[in-house]
Amino acid sequence: GIAIPRNSGCPNSEDKNFPRTVMVNLNIHNRNTSTNPKRSSDYYNRSTSPWNLHRNEDPERYPSVIWEAKCRHLGCVKADGNVDYHMNSVPIQQEILVLRREPRHCPNSFRLEKILVSVGCTCVTPIVHHVA
């Protein structure tokens, strides 16, 4: 593996007293970057498996707003605009880490949580089911 340089002042994570809780600065470093994926590219419209973006809002989570993709079609769009059902549009899912308020409604206390989000759609060959 790659050796990561370690600051001699870092706490020993193998110590049984190593904290399970940490202080996190929620001021986003690159806040100027667009958080609405619609603005960053138009792949969602140009793709052979186009998708729509939906705002998923949860005040008990940080970040509270996540944009999720839903495929527009069961099939894939051909160059002529026709839908080809011999191919399938499927969501591309990504596991991400978010902070969940715990206990609920507490402004400054969070627990790390993994969630699965759909970030776009792609075109795949369908699973063929053979009829006996």
Partner: antibody, heavy 120, light 108 residues
């Protein structure tokens, strides 16, 4: 006006064939994916099959695969369902339905339905 | 294969809010549409793409979809809303459209 009208239903013996038709009017038929949906008496809706705008791409529900064939004639604004090897469980009202231009997960126009009874 | 589960029946008093649920594994990742079917009539689309209402459908009909459940909400329910309601989505694994088995809405 914008409508779909099914025809061709009736009483047929098990193992025999029947062809249903659906006449479309009032909209650009050739621009829409079309579907057949059926409903057995007193039962749920069941999707049967679909055909793409140009007729090149088709999908079938497991219960009818290999027995039913969907087709269309855009020059006649017509949709068809050829049903072979009919079984008692195929008894139902058959609806033709138009797929929404915004995606398949919506049928925005339905016909009045035609009843198919499979009985000896 | 993918399944959509609906309660067989829901009862509501006139003027009250009716909520009809539709459950399926990770349903929020799929689009859901809702259909109203009155006795002896063809189904009518009332909600598509989870929340959108076709023209001609009253504003009292609304939809939502999160987690494993999509919900059709009818606010200020009227006697004319008494009908069977079906949810629908698609399943990529079987490349087919899937209907729930319907919920009978009774306006008391």
């Amino acid at each position: 006006q914008v409508q779909l009208v099914e025809s061709g239903g009736g009483v047929v013996q098990p193992g025999r064939s029947l062809r249903l038709s659906c006449a479309a009017s009032g909209f650009a038929f050739g621009s829409y994916t079309m579907h057949w949906v059926r409903q057995a008496p007193g039962k749920c809706l069941e999707w049967v099959t679909l055909i793409s705008f140009d007729g090149r791409s088709k999908l079938y529900g497991d219960s009818v695969k290999g027995r039913f064939t969907i087709s269309r004639d855009n020059s006649k604004n017509s949709l068809y369902l050829q049903m072979n090897s009919l079984r008692a469980e195929d008894t139902a009202v058959y609806y033709c339905a138009r797929g929404s231009v915004r995606g398949e997960a919506a049928f925005d126009l339905w016909g009045q339905g035609t009843l198919v009874t499979v009985s000896s | 294969s993918y399944e959509l589960t609906q309660p067989p029946s829901v009862s509501v008093s006139p003027g009250q809010t009716a909520s009809i649920t539709c459950s399926g594994d990770n349903l929020r990742t799929k689009y859901v549409s809702w259909y109203q079917q009155k006795p002896g009539q063809s189904p009518v689309l009332v909600i598509y793409q989870d929340t959108r209402r076709p023209s001609g459908i009253p504003e009292r009909f609304s939809g939502s979809n999160s987690g494993n459940t999509a919900t059709l909400t009818i606010s200020g329910t009227q006697a004319m809303d008494e009908a069977d309601y079906y949810c629908m989505t698609w399943d990529v694994d079987t490349t087919s459209m899937i209907f729930g088995c319907g919920t009978k809405l009774t306006v008391l």
